[in-house]
């Protein structure tokens, strides 16, 4: 009893975010096939004529590639045979944001999956004690953000307190005229307390913590991509 036509294979993608000016990865996996020459990978972008990238018969073929992706894409060729169709994207641009389709054809069948790729800028904040100020204050700086984020302060001792009245935040456009440097100063800080500077936009959330005591200053920062 035969089944005519090809089977559908499972293709899995993950929503991800790209940091403009840096390199990104559009993740896609599929059911592995040991016959490399029988695997075709096509990456497409909604609203763009032509392909983002094509890999077939064990090699790249960019003859149908849209020029906005020229020289910026590659698959992890040595990992294709184990089911990795992820796309490496060089020098992420704001205009790279959108809906991508990872289309796979193998000897087992074919399948596809979409992913939403967000682009922006995000960076780790660094908090320092500002000794120049008339009263003890903290300065939180993060070099690259886009779109413009919100900035909020919190403290371990005064949980739930609103620090907007005792802080000042500014956004300075960077030289490439897209991303911005974030600077926020918190005034009237007290010793033996842990303060947090939280920077967030619709792509990422970053937190910088600083603990100031009489004898030392301890810092910690973390960055989390949202909806990934």
């Amino acid at each position: 009893f035969g089944i005519s036509g090809k089977h559908f294979i499972t293709v899995t993608t993950f929503t991800s975010a790209g940091n403009i000016g840096e390199d990104g990865t559009l993740s896609c996996t599929f059911e592995p096939d040991i016959k490399l020459n029988g695997i075709v990978i096509q990456w497409l972008k909604e609203g763009i004529k032509g392909l983002v990238h094509e890999f077939k018969e064990g090699k790249d073929d960019l003859s149908q590639q849209h020029e906005m992706f020229r020289g910026r894409t590659a698959v992890f060729a040595d990992q294709v045979v184990v089911g990795n169709a992820s796309l490496r994207l060089k020098n992420v641009q704001l205009t790279d944001a959108g809906t991508y389709t990872c289309y796979i054809r193998t000897s087992k069948g074919k399948g596809n999956a979409n992913l939403e790729y967000k682009t922006g800028a995000f960076s780790m904040p660094e908090i320092n004690v500002d000794y120049n100020a008339s009263s003890e204050s903290l300065r939180c700086e993060a070099p690259r953000w886009f779109p413009q984020p919100t900035v909020a302060w919190a403290s371990q001792v005064d949980q739930g307190a609103n620090f907007s009245e005792v802080s000042n935040t500014s956004f300075e456009l960077n030289s490439e005229n897209v991303t911005m440097k974030v600077v926020s100063v918190l005034y009237n800080v007290t010793i033996n307390n842990t303060y947090s500077c939280m920077i967030e936009n619709d792509i990422a959330k970053a937190t910088g913590d600083i603990k100031v005591t009489d004898s030392e200053v301890k810092r910690r920062s973390q960055l989390q991509l949202l909806n990934s």
Epitope: G21, E22, K59, D60, L62, A74, S175
Partner: antibody, heavy 121, light 107 residues
């Protein structure tokens, strides 16, 4: 391994068109994993990237030369070519052809040995 | 265009010396930087790609480091064959550009 060899006239008159060909041996120009570039070096000076071409014929030219440059590819002969129009003495240089490492990394290897083109009447 | 600035333009050194050449990009190029060696009358030869990856067949005394805008090429122990001119090149974005070169000469 892949080798590249430039060929073409060593002397071109001002206002004329410089024409060079790069012949690829030991590999196929139709291998989709590579872009093929032209680079030049003025006597005693640094290197200037002119542009690149893919086997399908799609090109990207350095904006500083775009109005005068044409590149083409002949997959049947395993060759790609450079034409530079309206040349002046400032176009006197050693011209190299080279292959990028991959579709995403265009560090250049291998290179041709280079050919000196002098623009003079 | 991204400007690539190399320093120094000339470097005098002796066999066995540790030599460091710097390349600065006018804007961030991530790790998309290559280093080449060129000898008189010859084509450039690729040494390092993606800032720190040693190209096949290149001696391990050559190493590259850096990311963003600041990069270095280091020759751990200069050999007689290493006296040449060295160039950096960015391939982060079109048009690709080269540094002005650093000539390593015998002291």
């Amino acid at each position: 391994q892949v080798q590249l060899q430039e060929s073409g006239p060593g002397l071109v008159k001002p206002s004329q068109t410089l024409s060079l060909t790069c012949t690829v041996s030991g590999g196929s120009i139709s291998d989709g994993s590579y872009y093929w570039s032209w680079i030049r070096q003025h006597p005693g000076k640094g290197l200037e990237w002119i542009g690149n071409i893919y086997y399908s014929g799609s090109t990207y030219y350095n904006p500083s030369l775009r109005s005068r440059v044409t590149m083409s590819v002949d997959t049947s002969k395993n060759q790609f070519s450079l034409k530079l129009s309206s040349v002046t003495a400032a176009d006197t240089a050693v011209y190299y052809c080279a292959r990028g490492l991959s579709t995403i990394d265009e560090a250049f290897d291998p290179w041709g040995q280079g050919t000196l083109v002098t623009v003079s009447s | 265009d991204i400007q690539m600035t190399q320093s120094p333009s000339t470097l005098s050194a002796s066999v066995g010396d540790r030599v460091t050449i710097t390349c600065r990009a006018s804007k961030s190029i991530s790790s998309w930087l290559a280093w080449y060696q060129q000898k008189p009358g010859k084509a450039p030869k690729l040494l390092i790609y993606e800032a720190s990856s040693l190209h096949s067949g290149v001696p391990s005394r050559f190493s590259g480091s850096g990311s963003g805008t600041e990069f270095t090429l280091t020759i751990s122990s200069l050999q007689p064959d290493d006296f040449a001119t060295y160039y950096c090149q960015q391939d982060n974005s079109y048009p690709y550009t080269f540094g002005g070169g650093t000539k390593v000469e015998i002291k």
